[in-house]
Interface confidence: low
């Protein structure tokens, strides 16, 4: 007959489960409830996945693991005696008098409820990792946290390798016993203890529950340490960098923490499980009943099968672990869950040329010498597309790609960004803009709407800022109208003449090479490499400077890189940035410094792309630790990550312009990373490639 096999994780829980089974049987509740003994919640999840058990109640972190790794789904939720229903909130509390924000937590002293506790550890640490504020190398979260904060009290961290830092603020009991114990012996343990750690000035931030401050201030009946405390002297840190009153926890928190829930296999009828438990709670949740579902007192433990504070069980409508956990908690868990035993020992980097192989080999050696994890291995491929294929096929793990290639990697191969490049320090959005540069000329001034018949300079055919975006934008705006998808002819007819260097000039309209000049000897005209002096962003700007063209489509940094003494080549040495302007989409002209408001599109920086099952936080964690050692082009550690001059190449592994590798933050998909305008431009262009 039909039966539900509950998984118990301990002898007391098995005892209570047996009693529940008997009570249900006696009451005629169907289907039958049987009990299976597991050794832990993790083991029970495996038993359920293997169809050797059917159900267990789990906390949020375990629900995430069970859902993500084993396909289990939550079907029944616990509700507790509090106003927020099936959840509570994890908050970060600071003293009102301090100036700490979520963005300035590095180096501050932190108070935690306990190691691996939900609001005191899992949510804040996971959130800091997931948002890119805290980088973790080789899954060593404890080391990362101990390096990040300026000392902490994390009760239970005394047995770890980082107890010096993680237990530095702990004080034990009044006689100094039990320092850093995960028990009430440690005065800074649990919600009230972590808040006390903040209130007494030991720490600068406390990671606690939304109700903690209000329960421990304003003259509530409390131990002496809290009697004089006022809730108005504390504030919450919000995710957007602001702060808020402690009563504003619904709007200002790190994450909504889901209640515990009963999980089952995807093929199990959730309605059946709820009907079984609902019958049970109807009969066995009131005091004095022969069996009490929501009490564990009789077994000498707490929270057996269900949390003792459960007031009722409710059916879960959307039975997916993502929906139950909510995006805030889900994101935090993504940042936290990193199993060192499942971390591959190597990160296989895709390389595309001999110089790149050489630089990658040096990078692997340099990283290994510094004991950075995972170790780099270099695997060669024929092209970026070949890299994508090899990554999808799990033969390689990572490659740095440009915007267009990111689009292909995401759309066609399912890859995701793990880290990004960050270029100019003033470029706060970590990306650059496509701009149309013209000479400042009051007598012959023209606008973007008047480009027809002008002479144009482009970095090269297929170059993002030099071709794809400007041409895409002009097509989108209806200025260029390709017939039969023939973009090249349409562009050649739109401009009077152009220089658009190209690698394969077969069937290439001659006017697209008309302005090109080739090398010093006049050879290699219009070739798609630096032998053509008007090739690349610098070359396209030179084409404008030397009056070959009227407009140059370049990056927003190109003018600054080649004027005001920044480029000593003869053609650029005397140039001044004030002599150039930008054409804006609204028909105006603007100073070259106004690129953020006057551009054709924002192009994302290059990103490191990986398979979706790769832990992006370990990739960023490796790169972040590496750049501390090798990121500065003047470092003395034997390798320069963001410089290719030693290898007679340019932009090897990373663009040479990279200042830092940055976390992807919320831009965890190729579309998120690329941005809507840029994707639209690419899709506009690709719609013409018939």
């Amino acid at each position: 007959g039909m039966e539900v096999r509950w998984c118990a994780t301990s002898d007391p829980e098995q005892h209570k489960c047996g009693n529940m089974s008997e009570a249900f049987r006696e009451a005629g509740i169907q289907p039958s409830l049987l009990c299976v003994r597991g050794t832990s919640a993790d083991h029970c999840v495996q038993l359920i996945a293997a169809q050797e058990a059917d159900a267990i109640t789990l906390d949020g972190g375990a629900i995430y693991e069970a859902g993500k790794e084993h396909g289990l789904k939550p079907v029944v939720g616990e509700v507790y005696d509090q106003e927020v229903g099936t959840s509570y909130y994890a908050v970060a509390v600071v003293r009102r008098s301090s100036h700490v924000t979520i963005d300035t937590l590095k180096g501050v002293k932190s108070c935690h409820t306990g190691i691996n506790r939900t609001v005191g550890w899992n949510v804040p640490v996971g959130y800091l990792v997931e948002s890119g504020r805290l980088s973790v190398m080789g899954c060593d979260v404890l080391k990362a946290v101990s390096d990040y904060f300026g000392g902490s009290c994390v009760p239970g961290a005394g047995e770890t390798s980082y107890s010096e830092s993680l237990c530095r603020l702990c004080r034990g009991d009044s006689s100094g016993e039990g320092v850093c114990d995960k028990s009430p012996l440690e005065r800074y343990y649990d919600y009230s203890g972590a808040f006390r750690c903040l209130a007494e000035g030991a720490g600068d931030v406390a990671f606690v529950k939304h109700s903690t401050v209000l329960e421990n201030t304003d003259g509530k009946t409390l131990p002496s340490w809290g009697q004089a405390l006022l809730s108005q002297d504390f504030e919450l840190l919000c995710r957007d960098g602001s702060r808020a009153d402690v009563t504003e926890w619904r709007q200002c928190h790190l994450a909504r923490v889901p209640a515990h829930a009963v999980v089952v296999r995807a093929d199990t009828d959730g309605g059946l499980i709820f009907r079984l438990l609902n019958e049970g709670q109807r009969l066995f949740s009131h005091e004095g009943s022969s069996f009490q579902m929501f009490s564990s007192e009789a077994y000498g433990q707490k929270d057996l099968l269900f949390k003792d504070s459960t007031s009722e069980l409710v059916p879960i409508a959307t039975q997916t672990y993502e929906a139950w956990l909510g995006h805030e908690y889900l994101h935090a868990m993504k940042g936290l869950l990193c199993d060192p035993n499942r971390l591959p020992p190597y990160l296989r980097w895709c390389v595309l040329s001999t110089p790149e192989i050489q630089k990658c080999g040096d990078m692997a050696v340099a990283f290994r010498r510094q004991r950075l994890k995972p170790e780099i291995q270099c695997v060669s491929a024929k092209s970026p597309q070949h890299c994508m294929e090899r990554i999808q096929a799990e033969q390689v793990d990572a490659v740095t790609l440009s915007g267009e290639d990111i689009y292909t990697a995401g759309k066609t191969y399912g890859l995701v960004p793990a880290a990004g490049e960050h270029y100019a320090p003033e470029d706060s959005s970590n990306s650059y803009y496509v701009v149309a540069v013209v000479r400042r000329d009051s007598s012959h001034a023209f606008t973007l709407d008047e480009l027809r018949g002008k002479r144009s300079c482009h970095a090269g055919f297929g170059s993002p800022a030099g071709w794809d975006v400007p041409v895409g934008a002009l097509i989108q705006r209806g200025f260029i109208r390709p017939k039969d998808c023939d973009v090249l002819t349409a562009v050649s007819e739109f401009f009077n003449a152009s220089c658009v260097p190209v690698n394969n000039p077969k069937n290439y309209p001659s006017s697209l090479c008309a302005l090109c000049v080739g090398d010093e000897q006049g050879r290699n005209k219009c070739v798609g490499n630096s032998q053509e002096r008007y090739y690349g962003y610098r070359g396209a700007f030179r084409c404008l400077v030397e009056n070959a063209g009227d407009v140059a489509f370049v990056r927003h940094t190109t003018v600054f890189d080649n004027t005001n003494g920044h480029n000593s080549e003869p053609w650029a040495a005397e140039l001044r940035s004030e002599d150039y302007e930008l054409l804006c989409p609204n028909g105006a002209r603007a100073e070259v410094s106004q690129f953020a408001a006057c551009n054709l599109a924002q192009i994302p920086p290059h990103a490191v792309m990986v398979r979706p099952d790769t832990n992006i936080f370990t990739v960023y964690g490796l790169l972040d630790k590496a750049q501390d050692l090798f990121g500065d082009d003047h470092n003395k550690n034997g390798f320069k990550m963001f410089d290719s001059s030693n290898y007679h190449g340019q932009d090897l592994l990373f663009k040479d312009a990279t200042v830092r590798a940055v976390p992807v933050g919320e831009k965890t998909t190729y579309r998120g990373w690329l941005g809507l305008d840029y994707v639209a431009a690419l899709e506009g262009m690709s719609s013409q490639q018939c």
Partner: antibody
């Protein structure tokens, strides 16, 4: 219990397109990997490709230019299309599930459907 | 592709005997993560293939303990300690360490 059932025409003419359906019960097609394998006369098995829970596809490079695997989540079905078939494509076609629980071994298979390519 | 060679092609046995099937890979099946993704399947006459063993030696749920898998690197063995009538059919080994997954040519277990 998880069950997979392949269906489609048993006879396809050369140069035409072979289209098969894999209907899944007892599991959702939005979890795990759903694969197509074919068995040639004489027992040789060839892995053709998969569609994953997130809709990503992988195709055996030997078939890449001809194969397409799609799905309809509302019907809980996966589909195989093989273009420009020849007599060499005569085989029994199976769909199978792979999940993490068995480290992506194929834990459940359909009965298979026999397809002959002939004019 | 990675070639999987199974021997013997045909294995005549008496009921109650031990049977042993060998599978050899053209290259090591040890993944960079340390795991070896070598699996065994049985296809009984007129039935769909069934998973017996995954990752070299793990029995799939419901598979009798008379079936055992062993091996490492490139050489693997499936043993049936006491052959029963319901064990007859074609046994396949398969690897999924390397992409695409590949299969052995099959071993037909039949009654002497």
């Amino acid at each position: 219990e998880v069950q997979l059932q392949e269906s489609g025409p048993s006879l396809v003419k050369p140069s035409q397109t072979l289209s098969l359906t894999c209907s899944v019960t007892g599991d959702s097609i939005t979890s795990g990997y759903w694969n197509w394998i074919r068995k040639f006369p004489g027992n040789k098995l060839e892995y053709m490709g998969y569609i994953s829970d997130s809709g990503i596809t992988y195709y055996n490079p030997s078939l890449k230019s001809r194969i397409s695997i799609t799905r309809d989540t509302s019907k809980n079905q996966a589909y195989l299309q093989l273009n420009f078939v020849t007599a060499e494509d005569t085989a029994t076609y199976n769909c199978a599930r792979r999940t993490l629980a068995t480290y992506y071994a194929m834990d459940y298979w359909g009965q298979g459907t026999s397809v002959t390519v002939s004019s | 592709d990675f070639v999987m060679t199974q021997t013997p092609l045909s294995l005549p046995v008496s009921l109650g005997d031990q049977a042993s099937i060998s599978c050899r890979a053209s290259q090591s099946l040890v993944h960079s993560n340390g795991n070896t993704y070598l699996h065994w399947y049985l296809q009984k006459p007129g039935q769909s293939p069934k998973l017996l063993i995954y990752r070299v030696s793990n029995r799939f749920s419901g598979v009798p303990d008379r079936f055992s898998g062993s091996g490492s690197g490139t050489d693997f063995t499936l043993k049936i300690s006491r052959v029963e009538a319901e064990d007859l059919g074609v046994y396949f080994c398969s690897q999924s360490t390397h992409v695409p997954p590949t299969f052995g040519g099959g071993t037909k277990l039949e009654i002497k």
